[in-house]
């Protein structure tokens, strides 16, 4: 997997006007990395992962860039003519990413009322629209005022793709973020279904990379995808994820039953406890 | 002593049906996971099917898909395989196989095996 | 589907030598293959379950090694009664699939 750092920008319009708060996510490796608050802009890192790559220092320019990236997205919504009542929102999301073999890829997408209108390749420069005449018309739009504000200001659009990987490689340089394994701890546990079955629940934590193999198995053998029920695989919050599979199974038969897990090459198996113990579904002791 | 006894072998032409059938005893049917294996002429052994407890997984070889069908009756310990759509390729000696208690995925006991033969 | 190829196809060998066979396996199947033997004209029988385990009244001459994509069979003193062929199965995928088989025949 590649090494990845994504900007999400927010601005808001309310009845043609623009507001000015916005909202700036930043991820690191598809982690929750930075964040800038609506009014006030001050680089937030995301746990203390987010710290750790940082180190121990002011999030000035991190606020400054974002504050200048914030800045320029207003300006542009502000050019999107015919913008009807109520809220509208442009959305502007920037990734670049470095590969194992030094490659590089940078885009940049743009997003009006959570709908793709605009993308560019920042390393090509080139664009490319949906086929939606609306879609069309705002790309025309943004498009233009792009290319006169790239003539009058250095700020946003300037040499995107290279600023993006500047900041990725600066990040990568901390340590914290090289290419690393955090084996996850499984939990299983079991709680009353119905009369004779019981719902087992297999939690996968603190792992990372994301890709992670969890899956229900009666005498080894996998259970069908219907009769499993799996959780997305989230950021925890700590620069790990977390996710869940659970299974219904006749009471009785636990033992048949195990949790497999299998993540960056290591592979584990996982019965359901014994049923001396049980989490009950209800509010009593 | 755990017996698998398959039935229903036979000659067919192709295109034709047949149905086979596994009647166990030994052992507690229902709570067994069962499969078909399948073993032509002077050839290995080739997977079918498999059927867990409660019929709740069902799995097949793509090379039957859609034209076999596996399902069990643990009220009558039998496990069975209706083939439909013959063809010469599926001439072979059919093995009901059940699945070991907390294996991996093994195949613990099998039938003597009933022979199909598909010809016109 | 997870193919698995055996190697060798067949080996001539005499009572009491140590014979090995391989199992590839074309993808990672961790630890979830299965050793058969078959006898003509008899139905398989299970000698080693998830790589390395012993089924229960085989004999110990017989052992099973390796995970992820390389298996090994190994009789570590042939008796006459081990005259067969040898298949490794794997259960990793729900497309369970046997390999071609060894054969062991007297030298």
């Known amino acids: 997997e590649p090494h990845s750092l994504r900007y999400n920008l927010t601005v808001l319009s309310w009845d043609g006007s623009v507001q000015s708060g916005f909202l700036t996510e930043v991820h690191l490796d598809g982690q929750p990395f930075l964040r800038c608050d609506r009014q006030k802009c001050r680089a937030k890192p995301q746990g203390q992962w987010a710290e750790d790559v940082l180190g121990n220092k002011t999030w000035d320019r991190e606020t400054r860039d974002l504050t200048g990236n914030g800045k320029d997205l207003r300006m542009t919504l502000a050019h999107i003519k015919d913008q009807k009542e109520g809220l509208h929102s442009l959305q502007e999301i920037r990734v670049c990413e470095i590969h194992e073999d030094n490659s590089t890829r940078s885009s940049q997408h743009f997003y009006y009322d959570g709908e793709l209108f605009l993308s560019q390749n920042l390393e090509t420069k080139e664009w490319t629209m949906p086929q939606s005449s609306r879609a069309q018309t705002l790309a025309m739009n943004v498009r233009n005022f792009l290319k006169e504000d790239a003539m009058k200001t250095k700020t946003h659009y300037h040499a995107m793709h290279a600023d993006c990987l500047q900041e990725l490689r600066r990040y990568l340089k901390s340590g914290v973020v090289l290419r690393r394994t955090v084996p996850p701890m499984v939990n299983v546990t079991r709680s009353e279904a119905s009369e004779g079955n019981i719902t087992v629940t297999c939690r996968a934590s603190g792992f990372y990379p994301w890709n992670i193999t969890l899956s229900w198995r009666q005498d080894g053998v996998s259970l069908s995808h219907d009769t499993q029920q799996w959780g997305d695989v989230l950021p925890d919050g700590n620069g790990t994820y977390q996710t869940w599979v659970a299974t219904r199974i006749c009471q009785g038969e636990e033992q048949r039953f195990t949790c497999y897990m299998e993540h960056s090459g290591n592979h584990s198996t996982h019965p359901v406890p014994s049923g001396k113990v049980l989490v009950l579904q209800s509010h009593w002791q | 002593e755990v017996q698998l006894v398959e039935s229903g072998g036979g000659l067919v032409q192709p295109g034709g049906s047949l149905r086979l059938s596994c009647a166990a005893s030994?052992?507690?049917?229902?709570?067994?996971?069962m499969n078909w294996v399948r073993q032509a002429p002077g050839k290995g052994l080739e997977w079918v099917s498999y059927i867990s407890t409660r019929s709740s997984t069902i799995y097949y070889a793509d090379s039957v898909k859609g034209r076999f069908t596996i399902s069990r009756d643990d009220a009558r310990k039998s496990l069975y395989l209706q083939m439909n759509s013959l063809r010469d390729e599926d001439t072979a000696v059919y093995y009901c196989?059940?699945?070991?208690?907390?294996?991996?995925?093994?195949?613990?006991?099998w039938g003597q095996g009933t022979l199909v033969t598909v010809s016109s | 589907d997870i193919q698995m190829t055996q190697s060798p196809s067949s080996l001539s060998a005499s009572v009491g030598d140590r014979v090995t066979i391989t199992c590839r396996a074309s993808?990672?199947?961790?630890?979830?293959l299965n050793w058969y033997q078959q006898k003509p004209g008899k139905d398989p029988k299970v000698l080693i379950f998830?790589?390395?385990s012993l089924q229960s009244g085989v004999p110990s001459r017989f052992s099973g090694s390796g995970s992820g994509t390389d298996f090994t069979l190994t009789i570590s003193s042939l008796q006459p009664e081990d005259f067969a062929t040898y298949y490794c199965q794997q259960s990793y995928s729900t497309r369970f699939t046997f390999g071609p088989g060894t054969k062991v025949d007297i030298k």
């Open positions: 998830a790589a390395s």
């Open positions: 030994g052992f507690t049917f229902s709570t067994y996971s």
């Open positions: 993808q990672s199947i961790t630890y979830f």
């Open positions: 196989a059940r699945v070991m208690v907390r294996g991996s995925g093994t195949f613990d006991y």
